[in-house]
C-alpha cells in the first residue's frame, strides 16, 4: 500500500510462493533455500524465482518445487511468535543477475534505518486490489518502544515494526513471507498487522537476526553432506 512498481528484477532475492495462485512471498538466501513466514506454511509449494509480473511469462522465471518445508518448531499460530519458515528447493536455483540470494543479518535492526519492503500484496488499505507487478516500498525501522505502543502486549522480542505511524504506506495481504532488507541484509519477514496502512498500526515483521543460528543449523541438518569435526 502506498508503494511503487519495482524496477524489473531489481529485487533478485524476491520469490513468489504458489499453490495454484500466489499466496505469499519469500526470500532466496542460498541457491537451494528460501525463507518465508511460518504462517505461509502449506504442504505443497511451488517457488517462483525471477518474477516481476506474476501473471505473465517474461522469460526470466524459474519455477522450482519445494522439497522440504520446515516451520520453526516454536511457531505460535495465535501470537505469531517465531513466524518463520524455511523451504529447501528440489533443485538449486540458477543464480544470475535476476535471481540471487540476500545475505542474512549480522546485527539486529536499528531504529531509523531505511529498508526496502517488496511483494505482490494488496495495494489498498480498504478493499482489495492485487497487482501483477512487484511492488516496492521504502520505509524506516521503528523503535521497539513505538512498536510495543502500537500493539500493547502483542510484540515479542522476535518481532519489530517498520513503516509510518501516520499510516498510508505498509505491507498487506499477499506480502507475507516477503523481505525487509536494510543495507543489503535480510532484516525482516513480512508477518502481520491490524489492517494495512492504518494510523498507529505499522507493519509487524519477524526479526530474522534472532534466527540466524536456527537457519544455519537447519540448513546444515538438511543438507546431503554432513561434515563431522
Amino acid at each position: 500500500v502506498g508503494g511503487y512498481i519495482c524496477e524489473e528484477n531489481s529485487v533478485p532475492y524476491q520469490v513468489s510462493l504458489n499453490s495454484g495462485y500466489h499466496f505469499c512471498g519469500g526470500s532466496l538466501i542460498s541457491e537451494q533455500w528460501v525463507v518465508s513466514a511460518g504462517h505461509c506454511y502449506k504442504s505443497r509449494i511451488q517457488v517462483r524465482l525471477g518474477e516481476h509480473n506474476i501473471e505473465v511469462l517474461e522469460g526470466n522465471e524459474q519455477f522450482i518445487n519445494a522439497a522440504k518445508i520446515i516451520r520453526h518448531p516454536k511457531y505460535n499460530s495465535r501470537t505469531l511468535d517465531n513466524d518463520i519458515l524455511l523451504i529447501k528447493l528440489s533443485s538449486p536455483a540458477v543464480i544470475n543477475s535476476r535471481v540471487s540470494a540476500i545475505s542474512l543479518p549480522t546485527a539486529p535492526p536499528a531504529a531509523g534505518t531505511e529498508s526496502l519492503i517488496s511483494g505482490w500484496g494488496n495495494t489498498l488499505s480498504s478493499g482489495a486490489d492485487y497487482p501483477d507487478e512487484l511492488q516496492c516500498l521504502d520505509a524506516p525501522v521503528l523503535s521497539q518502544a513505538e512498536c510495543e505502543a502500537s500493539y500493547p502486549g502483542k510484540i515479542t522480542n522476535n518481532m519489530f515494526c517498520v513503516g509510518f505511524l501516520e499510516g498510508g504506506k505498509d505491507s498487506c495481504q499477499g506480502d507475507a513471507g516477503g523481505p525487509v532488507v536494510s543495507n543489503g541484509e535480510l532484516q525482516g519477514i513480512v508477518s502481520w498487522g491490524y489492517g494495512c496502512a492504518q494510523k498507529n498500526r505499522p507493519g509487524v515483521y519477524t526479526k530474522v537476526y534472532n534466527y540466524v543460528d536456527w537457519i544455519k543449523d537447519t540448513i546444515a541438518a538438511n543438507s546431503h553432506h554432513h561434515h563431522h569435526h
Epitope: 505469499c24 504462517h39 505461509c40 502449506k42 486490489d129 495481504q173 507475507a176
Partner: antibody, heavy 126, light 106 residues
Framework: QVQLQESGPGLVKPSETLSLTCTVS????????WHWIRQPAGKGLEWIGR???????YYNPSLKSRVTMSVDTSKNQFSLKLSSVTAADTAVYYC????????????????????WGQGTTVTVSS | DIQMTQSPSSLSASVGDRVTITCQAS??????LNWYQQKPGKAPKLLIY???NLETGVPSRFSGSGSGTDFTFTISSLQPEDIATYYC????????FGGGTKVEIK
C-alpha cells in the same frame, strides 16, 4: 446485520449462460471477500469462486473456464456468470460473505463463509 | 485438488448422546478446516473455524479438533435441534467441502 439476497432466472436453457446477482444489505460490500457456492438437490456443497471489491477473483479450478464473477460497489452487488450450462449445473446457488475481512496475517488465504443468502434454485432444461 | 473424506455419511443417535464425525484431507491442510451445519431447505451455518474455534453464538456443546490430515467434530450432548447435515470444509488451497454427514434422532 448484513443480509444477502440472490436473484436471477430460475430456468436456463442448455448451452446458455446462467446469470445471478447477490445484493448485500445492512452493510458495505467493500470490506469483505464474497463467494458463490452451489448445491445440487440432495447432494453436497461445491465452491464456485471468490471475488474482492476490486474485482480480484479466485475460481474453482474445475469450473474456471466457464465462470466469471464481477462486482458493482455502487449497487452493493456482486454477480456470477456460468457459461455453456448443462443439466449438471442444476442446483441451488448461494452467495456468501467471507469469514474475515482480511485478518491480521499478511498471507493470501481462504477463510470460509459466515453469512449466507437463502439460496436460489436454477434449473437447466430445454 | 484437495479431497475431503467425511465419515460416517449418516448416523442415528439418541438425545443426550455424544456424536463424533471425522473428516480426512487428502494432504496436510494444517488447521485450515471449518465445520458447517445445514438444516433442510436452509443455507449452511458456520459452527467451527480453523479446526477448533467456535463461531460467535454457537453453543458450547459443539467442538472441533485436529490438525494436518485428520479432524474431528463433536456434539457433546445431542439435542433435537441438532438434526441436520454437517459438512467439513478445507480452506488451505482454494475451498472444498466434505460429502456431509446426516445426523438423525433415534
Amino acid at each position: 446485520q448484513v443480509q444477502l439476497q440472490e436473484s436471477g432466472p430460475g430456468l436456463v436453457k442448455p448451452s446458455e449462460t446462467l446469470s445471478l446477482t447477490c445484493t448485500v444489505s445492512g452493510g458495505s460490500i467493500s470490506s469483505h471477500y464474497w463467494h458463490w457456492i452451489r448445491q445440487p438437490a440432495g447432494k453436497g456443497l461445491e465452491w464456485i469462486g471468490r471475488i474482492a471489491t476490486s474485482g480480484s477473483t479466485y475460481y474453482n479450478p474445475s469450473l474456471k473456464s466457464r465462470v466469471t464473477m464481477s462486482v458493482d460497489t455502487s449497487k452493493n452487488q456482486f454477480s456470477l456468470k456460468l457459461s455453456s450450462v448443462t443439466a449438471a449445473d442444476t442446483a441451488v446457488y448461494y452467495c456468501a460473505r467471507d469469514l474475515t475481512n482480511y485478518g491480521i496475517t499478511k498471507s493470501i488465504r481462504f477463510y470460509g463463509m459466515d453469512v449466507w443468502g437463502q439460496g436460489t434454485t436454477v434449473t437447466v432444461s430445454s | 485438488d484437495i479431497q475431503m473424506t467425511q465419515s460416517p455419511s449418516s448416523l442415528s443417535a439418541s438425545v443426550g448422546d455424544r456424536v463424533t464425525i471425522t473428516c480426512q484431507a487428502s494432504q496436510d491442510i494444517s488447521n485450515y478446516l471449518n465445520w458447517y451445519q445445514q438444516k433442510p431447505g436452509k443455507a449452511p451455518k458456520l459452527l467451527i473455524y480453523d479446526a477448533s474455534n467456535l463461531e460467535t453464538g454457537v453453543p458450547s456443546r459443539f467442538s472441533g479438533s485436529g490438525s494436518g490430515t485428520d479432524f474431528t467434530f463433536t456434539i457433546s450432548s445431542l439435542q433435537p435441534e441438532d438434526i441436520a447435515t454437517y459438512y467439513c470444509q478445507q480452506v488451505d488451497n482454494f475451498i472444498t467441502f466434505g460429502g456431509g454427514t446426516k445426523v438423525e434422532i433415534k
